[in-house]
């Protein structure tokens, strides 16, 4: 049995397009070998119509393409302007046509809405283009060609070959007379309006010998597709308006009262404030299709959405559109989680990211939403051990606590870290969460020295001062690497003297590195946690240098450098290419976990999520 798979039967009507996906095992050989679409002949051969190596048969010129998606193990054959002649038996396959790595597809194209009492029916979507074909006889070849629209009892001239254009059609209509060989003229109307619908009459000549042809134009207003999503979840609007508007500005708008449609986002850079931080307009394909992702759905997001194309970037009469009616289900399966997490400069935040607990093995991601252009979300860290260079030593993604929640810790905060962040996985696409990090006034709770230098072969002791509010928390030291933070042994040195108005419950916990080696160089974190839930962290960079004088080093706060400030981000970090999250497969279906416990008085990182989302803390 061939491992190739596809649709056994495809049925369509004249003038339509089909998109046939063929699936193959994505082995290295298969991914790179020739893909083809061929038509089976009566004698058993199969004549190639299109292949991945660039061949296109004259029968398919200008109306078909074949695209390989090696990462998915699929290739897609798109065929437009179908006619009944396209009906037949085909094969989609890999390699050589006769080799047998193929799948049989039956394509049946039936006659579309054809001639009814000599009236040609044209059914076209609002905003699209129609071509009305008008045949004539040789004796009228040199005579005036015209198109009339029947309004009430009277035909009204729309366009003629002498240059007249009815004002209602200005800028969106033309009359084409085919070459001398073809006895046909056509009228092309763009940006169709609902008011264009009706009976038309083509005419060649003006006397009793004139040729006439009736046409019935039906302009369809798109029925809204019903979309149901959960409160706090997300929705993706896929908008395919056709290649004829590939280079026209695109928009998504939400209908308010009457015919008004308020722009939510467009490709000209406009974005409604209510969607700040939770919307992405994914770049359009060559065919002009694009998608808009909205996360953190709210009750008030429900309504009718239109996507369209117009040079103004907003809905105008004649814009081609697609429509959706979004319903937001308030009995949501997605639990509440903080929408705002607050931290102080030099401090840290721990963000809990929910995901679908069925997808524990999925790759977890955290990205920073950027509002520039159409919105994008470059990756900062993932669960596979990748961390963006500028974040090394201060960002970690931990699989804990697990069972539907992972944790992201960001420390050495500066005002530049304020913004919107998205939690994602490579699993399902309907659940994603957004959290806003706000930087507020205040001092970090944990006190550590600034950057520290250790001497090869000696002992280094690094202190971390914990205020009394953390008395019930587990205190730890760990060494940061790009897959997490590996716990290290530490000593409780008793009460700390680093805090005013703090009783015996404050603590000084030291990290001791015995016989320092080059491998000890790097970032170290001290922090607090309760079980698998992480709270505040503080980071210290330990540099290692050659021995100068014997002895061990005991670093105190006084001797240490100042706490890192915003300049840290500028010091020699190598910019690497951003990985923007524009592939919908990177979005996750996730389950959020509410966290109402305060982060130990919350002077460093508290949570404020507004309205009904108010929470006590994001980290503990």
């Amino acid at each position: 049995k061939s491992p190739i798979f596809g649709p056994e039967e495809v049925n369509s009507v004249e003038g339509n397009s089909v998109s046939i996906t063929c699936y193959y095992p994505p082995t290295s050989v298969n991914r790179h070998t020739r893909k083809y679409w061929c038509r089976q002949g009566a004698r058993g051969g199969c004549i190639t119509l299109i292949s991945s190596e660039g061949y296109v048969s004259s029968k398919y010129a200008g109306r078909a393409n074949l695209t390989n998606f090696p990462e998915n193990g699929t290739f897609v054959v798109n065929i437009a302007q179908l006619s009944q002649d396209d009906s037949g038996r085909y094969k989609c396959g890999l390699g050589i046509n006769s080799r047998g790595l193929s799948f049989d597809v039956s394509l049946e194209v039936s006659q579309g809405p054809g001639l009814l009492n000599d009236t040609k029916v044209y059914t076209v979507d609002l905003g699209r283009t129609v071509t009305i074909n008008c045949p004539f006889k040789t004796e009228n070849a040199q005579k005036r060609k015209s198109l009339y629209k029947q309004i009430g009892l009277y035909p009204v001239l729309v366009i003629d070959s002498s240059g007249y254009v009815n004002p209602n059609y200005t800028g969106r209509i033309r009359l084409d007379i085919q070459g001398t060989g073809q006895l046909l003229f056509s009228v092309v109307i763009n940006q169709l309006r609902l008011s264009d619908a009706g009976q038309y009459l083509c005419q060649a000549g003006d006397d009793s010998n004139s040729n006439k042809k009736n046409a019935d134009l039906q302009v369809l207003k798109p029925e809204p597709e019903l979309v149901y999503e959960d409160l706090r979840g997300s929705v993706t609007f896929h908008c395919a308006l056709g290649p004829e508007v590939a280079n026209v500005a695109k928009f998504l708008c939400r209908q308010s009262s009457g015919e008004n449609c308020d722009v939510v986002v467009n490709t000209l850079g406009k974005r409604a404030p209510a969607f700040e931080g939770r919307i992405l307009l994914n770049p359009q394909d060559k065919d002009g299709s694009f998608s808009v992702v909205i996360t953190g759905l709210r009750k008030e997001d429900a309504g009718r959405y239109l996507c369209g194309a117009h040079s103004d970037g907003q809905l105008q009469e004649g814009s081609p559109i697609q429509a959706w009616q979004l319903f937001v289900n308030e009995e949501s399966t997605i639990p509440r989680s903080p929408t705002v997490v607050k931290g102080v400069a030099g401090g840290s935040v721990a963000v809990l990211c929910p995901y679908n607990r069925k997808e524990s093995k999925s790759i977890k991601y955290w990205c920073l939403w950027e509002g520039a252009q159409n919105g994008r979300c470059p990756l900062l860290v993932d669960s596979e051990g990748w961390v963006k260079a500028q974040y090394e030593g201060r960002l970690s993604l931990l699989e804990e606590p697990g069972n539907g929640t992972f944790t992201v810790i960001l420390n050495q905060l500066t005002s530049r870290d304020a913004g919107f962040y998205w939690c994602l996985t490579n699993g399902d696409t309907l659940w994603r969460t957004t959290v806003e990090i706000k930087i507020i006034e205040g001092e970090p709770n944990l006190k550590v020295p600034g950057n520290v230098t250790a001497v090869l072969g000696e002992t280094l002791k690094v202190p971390c001062h914990f205020p009394c509010k953390f008395s019930s928390y587990e205190k730890y030291w760990c060494k940061w690497n790009n897959t997490g933070c590996q716990a290290l042994p530490s000593q409780d040195e008793g009460p700390s003297k680093a805090f005013v108005n703090c009783d015996e419950n404050s603590r000084l916990v030291s990290l001791t590195l015995n016989l320092v080696t080059r491998a000890d160089e790097g970032w170290y974190w001290c922090g607090v946690k309760q079980g698998h839930f992480y709270g505040e962290t503080a980071a210290v960079y330990v540099a290692v240098e050659e021995r100068k004088a014997a002895g061990s080093r005991d670093v105190s706060l006084a001797k240490a450098d100042a706490a890192p400030d915003e300049k840290v981000l500028d010091s020699g970090f190598r910019e690497i290419e951003n990985k923007a999250i524009q592939d919908p497969r990177l979005f996750a279906e996730e389950k959020a976990v509410a966290d109402t416990r305060d982060q130990a008085d919350g002077s460093r990182a508290s949570v404020d999520s507004g309205s009904s989302e108010e929470q006590g803390g994001s980290s503990r």
């Epitope: 649709p7 495809v10 397009s17 089909v18 996906t21 998915n72 699929t74 019903l226 319903f327 497969r585």
Partner: nanobody, 130 residues
Amino acid sequence: QVQLVESGGGLVQTGGSLRLSCAASGRTFSPYAMGWFRQAPGKEREFVAAIRWSGATTYKYVGDSVQGRFTISRDAAGNTVYLQMNSVKPEDTAVYYCAADRVPKDISIDPRNPKDWDYWGKGTLVTVSS
């Protein structure tokens, strides 16, 4: 809530025919694709057939083990799907599940993969006696 209700299952003799129906209802549900999977005792869920549509175009998919014997179709409204089972064999004995999808999936989604379907019916038992 969306509901898929299968009907038409029962006992049939080897070589005979059976027609299963699956009706989708609830939340003004309008799927983009519907399909059939089956599960025999102690075996994994197996793809049988699927039908996907976009405007006036329909795409029909059939599993290897039933090719040439089973056909899938739908009603004009697109809310009911049928599985016509001809020349049935004892190995066709299984619980037949209807599946539906309300989201037009990315081209990389393989209709044979049960994980890629949003909604499932409770199943109808088909027993083929020899």
